[in-house]
Structure formats: C-alpha cells, structure tokens
C-alpha cells in the first residue's frame, strides 16, 4: 500500500501503527519528539521498502536501532530533501546503531548523522555503496569510534563474515551491526542490484529484487514504476508522479493536494503530473490541467467577490499573500495591531497592480505605506465618488507614503485626495503627484494644506554630529545645537538607535504607530546652557556590534498658519569596542597516547571581537583506580565514559597529530597556528551547524492543533 503524502510520527510512539500496511511512503517519514523511553521491540514494519522523499529521526527516546523497525527499507529516493539531506539522524539519545541492513540506495541527497551521543557502527558502513557522492555527508558529534569498539560479525571468532572495502585508505570489514553485514553485489553486476543470492537484478531494478533479470521482481525501480513493471520512462498517455511512478491523465485530474482549492488540482507539464505549474509557467485558464510560459514574472491574480477588499487586520491581509494583481479595490483601515508593518509587508508586499482604487482611512496604526513595496500601478478602473482612485483620509500617524527615490508608481486614471493626515507633510504629497503622473488632475481642495502635516516638523534641516566616542558597551555622541527661528519652539531631541549589522537601514523600518518599532528611542532634554552641544551616553550595548543612530529635534509644530522647520540627522553607523569573550564551549579532552592529551573546544558564543588566541591551563590529578578493574580485551567491558552529549568527534583531531620541525631541531612541538583559510572554514562550519539546527527546529516545531 502507498502511504503519504508524508508521515509525521511524534509525541506518541503508538502512532507508529500508521506504518503497518505501508510498502512505499510517497513523501517523507518523520519520527520525532518521543520523550518517554518506550520498548519498540513489538513494532516491526517489514512491508516498508521505499521512502520517496527523506527519513528524519529526531529525539526519540529509547530507540536503540532502526533495524527492527524497518528491516526491509531498501531505498530512500530523496525526491524532496530535508535541507539537502535524504537521511537525518539528529539528537537520538539512545540510538546505538543505525541497523538499516537492507538499505542499498539513497538516490539523491546526502546524510546527516549528528549529536547522537551513543551511536556506533558509523565507521563500519561504506556509504559510497549507497550514495553516489559521499562528500556532502555530515557525520559529526556521535560516539567516538574509539569508545565504540565496533566489531563486524565473526571477527571476534576470527571467522569474519562480512566483505571489506577501503574508506580513507583503510581497508576494513563493512557491517551495520554486530550481527548484520553490509550487503555488496558481485562486481559482475556493475551498477545493478542483486538478489540475496548474489544474482544480478534487471537493470531497471534499484536496491534489490526477488528474482534475477526480471523487471517485475524489483523491490524498487531505478526510474519509474508502472502497472507492476519497472520502466525507464513512463509509457505514452501516462505521466511521471512524485518522482517514482507513472499515472494516467484521469488519476492526475482527480487528485488534490492538501493545500489546494477545490478547482485547482494537479497539472500535467513536461510529461509530469505535478501539484503546481513550475516556476515561470502558469495554468492555461483556471480549470486547466496544462501550463503555459509566463511573460515576465508569473502573475497571481486575486479577485474580491464584493469588489472591495477591506484590510482591517493581519488576518484579512493574509488572504492576499502571493498576489501580484488585485482585481478590485483596496480599502485599508488598520486602527491597531501588533508588528503590523512587517506583517502587512509579508502578505501584501507582492501586489504590483490594483485595478480599482486604493483608499486608506482611519489607519492610525500606519506610519508609512512602504509595506506595499511592489505597488507600481493603480489603474483606477473603478473610482470613488468624485473620481478619486487614491484616497487618504484621517490617518493620525501616517508620516511617509513611499520612498520616492526608489519607487515608480503610476495612477492611470482618477485623482488623489488627502485630508486630516496631521503627520503627513504636504511636500510628501506633492512629490507623489509628480511621481504618479497625477499632477494637474487634483483640484484645490483635494490636497488640504491646512490639515495635512499640521502636527509634523515638515521642512527638515539637517542635524550634524560633532563627536562620537565608543567603549565596549557605550557610545557617546554629540551634535550641533539646532536653532529654529524662535528658540522657544525647540522642545527636546529624540535619539533613535538599533543594532545594524549592515548599513542599509531606513527610518521607517518595521515601524508602526502601535509601539512596534525596531528602533530604540531615548529623549534628550535641551542643555540649560545655550552654548553647550547636546549629546547622549547610550549604555548597555553589546561589545563589537555595529549600531545605527539618528537624532530628531522635537519642535512645536505650528506657529499660527506657518509650518515650522524641524530637523533630523542622517543615519550614523558606529561600532562598539571589543571586550572579553564569553567562555569557550563544549570543552573535551582525550588522550591519544601515554604522554599526550588532546583538548578540543568550540569558540565562545559571544566572541565580542576578533579572537586572536586561547589560553589553556592544566594540572595533574590523582589516578582513578576504577580504570584498573576492567578487562580491556573484552569487547563488552569497555567502561563508558560519559561524554559531553552529542558534540564533536575527537577523531577529527586525533587522526593526524601534527609534529613540526622547529628551529632547525627535529622533534615534536606545537602545531602551527591555524591559517586564515582554516579559521574561515571552521567559522563557516559552525555557522552551517547553527543554520541546520535552526532549520530543523523551524520545520518540526509546529503549533498544537486546535
């Protein structure tokens, strides 16, 4: 039986029963987050032979081997991968061996086996027999091989049963467990699979077969499966499906994905039955099963039944996710919300065209319209009374429309109307007239010069910084004293600052009027002495971190009918000084001879600067008598030393202890300092590890269903 579209077994080990009748999992298999150690011996799924996507195991307590669960798992196709991997075994606390003794082929993708503190029998598997390329495999932080004492079947009795291959210049026996060899086919079979009796399978078989040279006896197919036969390509009038089988048009026409709407089923494109048209193609009509190329970027047309879509919350904006053309009118009415600017950008940021009008009213939560970051055309096919196609009324905190230096917006038909936007400067509106091509369409009352910008410092002067001083967690800055025409109009200054790894921030980033603001704000009172330059000490900052800072003068906004001048600075980027790093992580030590200790650690999580060297101190301690109570020649009596759970394999260091020739004399001495390239590689490695772990957590931790 084919199971799918992906099976996620979590929290309760009894959910494994879902796999009972599966021969092929069309999709992925997740087994994860089972925190209570269980007895898995009664669970066995001999029918399962193929997983078409990937297998992921994560934090399953009590599971010691996969061999009993999946004794006949032969192929993992890797049609879709988990972060480039077809097999992921991560933080499996009790796993002692992989044990998938019938696994013969991972068609696409690599493997990642990491942070499994008890996992052995890794160096005894020759992954090159299973995967095409082993260079992308990532096997790190498992039980060190020296503590495993991996022995393949028969070696203790000096009657080895397994075959040997060479890995890293080491010719050795290959096995999955203490009693299961790794299967290898005779060299006469070449790339072909073979039966248990070493007879070569049909070339279209993959992994194994029940009878030689028979394309109906394959355990899995190299290419495609159709009507009980493995075929090199799908026959006429059938289509590739999920990367492994052939289906007919009726089948493809009749299935829906978990996410799709009723009408939008699968499509047939380039001989394949797929969920959606591929990138650069679009359905040839809403009910069509066929794809045609897009002209330019593919549009997603969204239509509102009631003609006007009201955006009054994040939920209503969510309906527009991915839309590039909106057929209808947009009425934006955002009075409140949490993190509203970035949420709106997430859901409405792709809209390029609105066919009707855009009306923004009572949106007190908005500071800017930059969340409509791709809007380039308002057609105005439908207009508000008075022939308005862009209408902005009573938005108490709206300060910016768009960044007109980086924005082309055309309003094809209709006029603009602006009223009661007290923080929106008229100059900003006039700029929009020029950019959108609406200049001359508006009549006198359409842009109200009295009640737009009445509470804003509109004509801005530039404040100049005069000095900056930094320490590890402080920045002191001063700036020129600003002198408006009437000194009494200057109330105070506000300093805005935030972490800015890159010099690309803008004043309105992530800002809305409901308190969501990526900038920290500090008010600075006027110095009592008119000749003293204003300044501030920003403290509690992170060492060796770049910050963006700018300052605004807070001024009285109206002197009778005149808008008074305000002032603000450019954005200044400034880095704090370096400081003492946090402690190194994951310190490990192991002896690789009678006179040497290898010590290994990870860099501190907060380097607080550029690390230049480490200091290592050690002292002698009394010998532990416990070590003498064991027979080290007996395989099963190796004492378990508790290692830091799932960190980094000591083997990485001990394989090639460096000895250098120093000062003309031969003899061992300190290893050469790491080259920049080595340091960079290690940094990238650490970063990659972090990125993968984040990806894993983000992928598998989901809200509990209602």
């Amino acid at each position: 039986e084919i199971c799918g579209p992906g099976i996620d077994i979590r929290n309760d080990y009894q959910q494994l029963k879902r796999l009972e009748n599966c021969t092929v999992i069309e999709g992925y298999l997740h087994i994860l987050l089972i925190s209570k150690a269980e007895d898995y011996r009664s669970y066995r799924f001999p029918k399962l032979t193929v997983i078409t996507e990937y297998l992921l195991l994560f934090r399953v307590a009590g599971l010691e081997s996969l061999g009993d669960l999946f004794p006949n798992l032969t192929v993992i196709r890797g049609w879709k991968l988990f972060y480039n991997y077809a097999l992921v075994i991560f933080e499996m606390t009790n796993l002692k061996d992989i044990g998938l003794y019938n696994l013969r082929n991972i068609t696409r993708g690599a493997i990642r086996i990491e942070k499994n503190a008890d996992l052995c029998y890794l160096s005894t598997v020759d992954w090159s027999l299973i995967l095409d390329a082993v260079s992308n495999n990532y096997i790190v932080g498992n039980k060190p091989p020296k503590e495993c004492g991996d022995l393949c079947p028969g070696t203790m009795e000096e009657k080895p049963m397994c075959e040997k291959t060479t890995i890293n210049n080491e010719y050795n026996y290959r096995c999955w467990t203490t009693n299961r060899c790794q299967k290898m086919c005779p060299s006469t079979c070449g790339k072909r699979a073979c039966t248990e009796n070493n007879e070569c399978c049909h070339p279209e078989c993959l992994g194994s077969c029940s009878a030689p040279d028979n394309d109906t006896a394959c355990v899995a197919c190299r290419h495609y499966y159709y009507a009980g036969v493995c075929v090199p390509a799908c026959p006429p009038n059938t289509y590739r499906f999920e990367g492994w089988r052939c289906v007919d048009r009726d089948f493809c026409a009749n299935i829906l994905s978990a996410e799709s709407s009723d009408s939008e089923g699968f499509v047939i494109h380039d001989g394949e039955c797929m969920q959606e048209c591929p990138s650069g193609f679009i359905r040839n009509g809403s009910q069509s099963m066929y794809c045609i190329p897009c002209e330019g970027p593919c549009p997603k047309v969204c239509e509102e039944e009631k003609k006007t879509k009201t955006i009054d919350s994040v939920t209503s904006a969510q309906m527009l996710q991915g839309c590039t053309i909106f057929k209808g009118n947009l009425l934006i009415n955002i009075r409140r919300g949490n993190n509203i600017a970035s949420e709106l950008e997430n859901f409405m940021g792709l809209i390029e065209v609105v066919t009707g009008y855009v009306k923004i009213r009572h949106s007190h939560a908005l500071v800017s319209l930059s969340f409509l970051k791709n809007l380039r055309l308002i057609l105005g096919e439908e207009q508000l009374e008075g022939n308005y196609s862009f209408y902005v009324l009573d938005n108490q905190n709206l300060q910016q429309l768009w960044d007109w230096d980086h924005r082309n917006l055309t309003i094809k038909a209709g006029k603009m109307y602006f009223a009661f936007n007290p923080k929106l400067c008229v100059s900003e509106i006039y700029r929009m007239e020029e950019v959108t091509g609406t200049k001359g369409r508006q009549s006198k009352g359409d842009i109200n010069t009295r009640n737009n910008g009445e509470r804003a410092s509109c004509e801005s002067d530039v404040l100049h910084f005069t000095s900056t001083t930094t320490s590890k967690n402080r920045i002191i800055i001063t700036w020129h004293r600003y002198r408006p025409p009437d000194y009494r109009d200057l109330i105070s200054f506000t300093v805005y600052y935030k972490e800015a790894p890159f010099k690309n921030v803008t004043e309105y980033d992530g800002q809305d009027a409901c308190g969501s603001n990526s900038w920290n704000m500090v008010d600075v009172d006027l110095p009592p002495n008119k000749d003293v330059e204003p300044g501030i000490l920003l403290h509690g900052l992170k060492p060796w971190t770049q910050y963006a800072v700018y300052v605004k003068a807070v001024t009285l906004t109206m002197v009778e009918n005149d808008h008074i001048r305000g002032a603000k600075s450019e954005i200044l980027y400034i880095r704090t000084n370096a400081s003492v790093p946090s402690i190194p992580l994951d310190v490990l030590s192991a002896s690789n001879s009678s006179s040497q200790l290898i010590v290994k650690w990870n860099p501190p999580s907060l380097p607080n600067g550029n690390l230049s060297y480490y200091i290592v101190r050690w002292q002698r301690q009394p010998q532990d008598g416990y070590l003498y109570r064991h027979n080290y020649c007996s395989k099963d009596k190796i004492p378990i030393r508790k290692y830091a759970d799932g960190t980094i394999d000591i083997e990485e260091v001990t394989e090639n202890p460096k000895t250098e020739v120093c000062g003309g004399e031969k003899g061992p001495c300190c290893a050469c300092p790491k080259t920049e390239a080595e340091k960079q590689a290690e940094k990238e490695e650490a970063e990659y590890r972090k990125v993968f772990e984040n990806f894993l957590h983000n992928s598998i931790f989901v809200p509990r269903p209602e």
């Epitope: 199971c3 799918g4 579209p5 009980g228 007919d248 994905s257 978990a258 009723d262």
Partner: antibody, heavy 123, light 112 residues
C-alpha cells in the same frame, strides 16, 4: 479507452450466493478503488462497499457486512462481489464503479461505471 | 447513516426553461478538513449513472455549462439554466464524506 465490463445477468434462488465480476481495462487497475453500488427495480442507488486492489482492504456498508465479500485479481484486473444468503429484496442491478485510490484528497468519487449486472432472486 | 432527501421527486419541465433540484442531508457533510463531497449524478433511461457535479459546485469534464451546483453544510441545489430534451432522466445527489456513503432517493426530470 477506460472500461468496466461486468458479467452477465444471473437468476438465483433465495438462500443461494451470487458472484458478480467486473473486468477493468484502459487504466492501471491498482490506482483505483472498486466500488459496488446496487439499484433495485424502480428504486434509487445504494452503495455497498469498496475494495483496495493493492492489498485487498475492504470498506463495507454495515447493512451488507455479514453477507458480502469483495475481492480482486490484479493479474486479470478483475474485481468480484459475492453476496450470500440471497433474499428476494436483493433483486437489483449491481454496478461496479471506480474511485481514485490516493492517500490525499480526491476531487470526485465515481467517474467510470460498469453497465450493471441484473441479479434476480426468485424461488 | 446520513439520509439524503431530494425534492421534488418528479420535475416536469418545458424545454428551454430552468429547473432546480434540492438535496438536504440529515447532518453536515463537511469533513474535518473542510472538504464537502457532495456530488450529482444523472442516470438516463437504460444507462448507468454519470457524474455531473463534484464537490458541491464543480462541473465534471464534458458536462455542459447549463448545469451548476451550489450549497453548503446540509442544503444543496442543482440548477439547469435551460433544460434540453437530452437532460431527461433521474438525478441523484450523493454524499461521500461519511461512511456509509449515501444517495438521495432521486428526482425524475421529464419533458412537458
């Protein structure tokens, strides 16, 4: 083209059994469930159950559970429906109809029907 | 079991005129994932049934656009905008959301 060809009409005595066959062609037999629907003379349609040809898994209407057995032979792409302990009210046309076999969501149920097999139960 | 009740049971119509058939389920046939498997089948005299509408409102391929379906929850309707002579037969609604799947008792459409 896609076809479901059913066996010929049957006349049975009360208490006997009948086995109706439905031979599929023009599509992959194992990609679809086979359903059985009956229609008594002048009456409406009644779903009896279905079978998954891949593993023989069945889903019966409780009304027929004790008397019906559905089977398939994948080598000949044929489905069978056996009804035991026949009564006179089992006189009906018995239809086979296919329905997509997919773990996900399907759009519709019975897109292809057989012509029907008339089973008459009479003493 | 879910009972599907159709009305009217008989529907005489003049060609070119519209027709409407109602189908009511004894309980909601919306599945937990939001899918509603409500279908309409037409059985022409002496033939096997044929699919017209699936999932409440979607026309099956080859079905003329004069046929349309609507409804939600427990109330559903099949409409024929302009009846033609070839539309005669018995129309059945069918729910495929809950086992056992059930048909309505049928509505016989005939030409006046």
């Amino acid at each position: 083209q896609v076809q479901l060809v059913q066996s010929g009409a049957e006349v049975k005595k009360p208490g006997a059994s009948v086995k109706v066959s439905c031979k599929a062609s023009g599509y992959t037999f194992t990609d679809y469930y086979m359903n059985w629907v009956r229609q008594a003379p002048g009456q409406g349609l009644e779903w009896m159950g279905n079978i998954n040809p891949n593993n023989g898994g069945t889903n019966y209407n409780q009304k027929f559970k004790d008397r019906v057995t559905m089977t398939t032979d994948t080598s000949t792409s044929t489905a069978y429906m056996e009804l035991r302990s026949l009564r006179s009210d089992d006189t009906a046309v018995y239809y086979c109809a296919r329905w997509i076999l997919y773990y996900g969501r399907s759009k519709w149920y019975f897109d292809v029907w057989g012509r029907g097999t008339l089973v008459t139960v009479s003493s | 079991d879910i009972v599907m009740t159709q009305s009217p049971l008989s529907l005489p119509v003049t060609p070119g005129e519209p027709a409407s058939i109602s189908c009511r389920s004894s309980q909601s046939i919306v599945q937990s994932n939001g899918d509603t498997y409500l279908e309409w089948y037409l059985q022409k005299p002496g033939q096997s049934p044929q699919l017209l509408i699936y999932r409440v409102s979607n026309r099956f391929s080859g079905v003329p656009d004069r046929f349309s379906g609507s409804g939600s929850g427990t109330d559903f309707t099949l409409k024929i905008s302009r009846v033609e002579a070839e539309d005669v037969g018995v129309y059945y609604c069918f729910q495929g959301s809950h086992v056992p799947y059930t048909f309505g008792q049928g509505t016989k459409l005939e030409i006046k």
